[in-house]
């Protein structure tokens, strides 16, 4: 058993090297130390993140993909260790960086924030959706009145530079909008967004942000609502929101105000109708919202509300499309 | 109708040069990325390079880095393949192909044949 | 990087048959898997995306089907203008394609 060897010597990995491969994304590679006897055991490798978040795990692999914020540098160590049923042998660490960026942390954006909506395609796709995404921030408090923001992101492989912004009083860039892009919340692929700046005063310094498309991804209405008064009856009736998910993968909530006492009647529906018995001297507004349910994907937030209908008294039964 | 038509291609020596142009017409050419896939004689498809609508971002397949270089000229709807340090590996058809991101290639232009060779 | 095997290598089907062709794909590519056709001397066609969508003009004897990483390409009714190389595609991390079926008639 070569742990309880006393003379084993587990040696430190080499050439361990930190590569920035994409927006908020390392490589961290490293060679087996070629002067380790018994090459031909099971050797793995302890890896730490010390810097911007710690972290640690095991591999076997010489390489890993680390996707982390890179605006405050970043930092790991490696080492070799051997494990058995009851011990486990450790190198000592090798370690390396990534400087952090240059520029003084109040010249950075604050406050970013993204959503994602599902919109109709506008050309020639292959697919009848797509998704487009809108981001604001706030202008580093330290920024110089010159500054300009610049907004990337980044989907797995594929990294997109903003061409729409809009503007503050000084023309300086405080949201973007691509009206489409290559996001999806299949997987669990992260989003990643960075803003650089640049001033003629001063190093600007820049901002990464990861977000989980699931919890950017703002549902929309549902679509098509109708509401119709049969004696004491109010029949509501809807479509799926405009998304690539099918019918079955939605949950709608449904708020039914009456507007004399002030009385609110939520229910929660997997069906995409509801009858509500009603008097008949109130005038009621009503609304519904979408989520996306398992097994369809993660459960997400509630989506915005549909367009109120009024209905009731000294309002015609009437059926109104939104 | 969509349509790609990519340059004449030809015999190169090893270690020389060549470009390769595709022009796009049929489609509003800056709204779709554009790629390059080869196929090697009486082998299988092999992707080679993308680029973003406006050229900003492109992406290689490891094996070309370094030595290929696509861009595109959006105003003259053309697709460019820059091949640079040619070996005997880069011998194949050259497609031009249309996509969108993470999409398939929906339409693909009728190849140009390279080979590299002494 | 992705990892797409294709199966089998080649195939003989006689007219009317039903042919499967199978793709298997080195870690779950989510369904942004195509099928493409090749006939001799030309480039390849776009049959099936996103693992089951049929494209544009493409006759409903194809189909796809899958999830995760294992799919394929069903052809009922194998006709003679069907006799071609047939490729899958992942599209979920860069582009890479299967190493082809060969397709011939008995």
């Known amino acids: 058993d070569l742990l309880n060897h006393k003379k084993f010597l587990l040696l430190p990995p080499v050439n361990f090297t930190i590569k920035a491969t994409g927006l908020a994304q390392v490589l961290l590679h490293w060679d087996p130390n070629p002067d380790q006897e018994q090459r031909h055991v099971d050797l793995e490798y302890h890896v730490k993140i010390n810097a911007p978040q710690e972290d640690e795990y095991d591999t076997r692999k010489t390489e890993s993909k680390c996707v982390t914020p890179l605006h405050e540098g970043f930092a790991a160590s490696v080492r070799t260790i051997l494990k058995s049923s009851h011990t486990t042998l450790a190198s000592s660490w090798v370690s390396a960086e990534l400087k952090a960026p240059p520029g003084s942390p109040g010249t950075s954006v604050t406050n970013l924030t993204c959503t994602t909506h599902t919109v109709v395609s506008s050309h020639t796709h292959l697919r009848p959706y797509q998704v487009s995404l809108r981001c604001t921030w706030l202008v580093g408090k330290d920024a110089p009145e010159d500054t300009q923001y610049f907004l990337y992101y980044r989907f797995g492989v594929l990294t997109e530079k903003c061409q729409e912004y809009s503007r503050d009083a000084l023309n300086r860039n405080t949201a973007c909008w691509f009206p489409r892009t290559f996001i999806n919340s299949k997987g669990f692929e992260q989003l990643a967004v960075h803003i650089n700046g640049s001033s003629k005063r001063a190093a600007i310094k820049p901002f990464d942000q990861l977000f989980s498309p699931l919890a950017i991804d703002q549902v929309n209405p549902p679509r098509n609502v109708t509401v119709e008064i049969e004696s004491n009856s109010l029949y509501i009736q809807w479509e799926k929101p405009l998304s690539a998910f099918p019918d079955h993968c939605f949950n709608y909530e449904l708020k039914i105000y009456n507007t004399k006492n002030g009385h609110i009647q939520k229910e929660k529906l997997i069906a995409n109708k509801f009858i509500s018995k009603i008097d008949d001297v109130s005038t009621y507004s009503i609304q519904v919202r979408a989520a996306v349910s398992s097994p369809c994907r993660m459960p997400g937030r509630w989506g915005e509300w549909s367009q109120p209908i009024y209905v009731g008294k000294e309002r015609k039964s009437l059926v109104e499309w939104h | 109708e969509v349509q790609l038509v990519e340059s004449d291609g030809g015999l190169v020596q090893p270690g020389r040069s060549l470009k390769l142009s595709c022009a796009a017409s049929?489609?509003?050419?800056?709204?779709?990325?554009m790629a390059w896939v080869r196929q090697a004689p009486t082998k299988g498809l092999e992707w080679v390079a993308t680029?973003?609508?406006?050229?900003?971002?492109?992406y290689y397949r490891d094996s070309v880095k370094g030595r290929f270089t696509i861009s595109r000229d959006n105003a003259k709807s053309t697709l460019y393949l820059q091949m640079d340090s040619l070996s005997s590996e880069d011998t194949a058809t050259y497609y031009c192909?249309?996509?969108?991101?993470?999409?398939?290639?929906?339409?693909w232009g009728q190849g140009v044949m390279v080979t590299v060779s002494s | 990087d992705i990892r797409m095997t294709q199966s089998p290598a080649s195939l003989s089907a006689s007219l009317g048959e039903t042919v499967n062709i199978e793709c298997l794909a080195s870690?779950?590519?989510?369904?942004?898997l195509a099928w493409y056709q090749q006939k001799p001397g030309k480039s390849p066609q776009l049959l099936i995306y996103?693992?089951?969508s049929l494209q544009n003009g493409v006759p409903s004897r194809f189909s796809g089907s899958g999830s995760g990483t294992q799919y394929s390409l069903k052809i009922n009714s194998l006709q003679s203008e069907d006799v071609a190389t047939y490729f899958c595609?992942?599209?979920?991390?860069?582009?890479?394609f299967g190493g082809g079926t060969k397709l011939e008639l008995k």
């Open positions: 192909a249309r996509h969108d991101g993470y999409y398939p290639f929906d339409y």
């Open positions: 049929g489609f509003t050419f800056s709204d779709f990325y």
């Open positions: 680029i973003s609508y406006d050229g900003s971002s492109a």
């Open positions: 870690e779950d590519i989510y369904s942004d």
């Open positions: 996103d693992a089951n």
């Open positions: 595609q992942q599209y979920n991390n860069y582009w890479t």
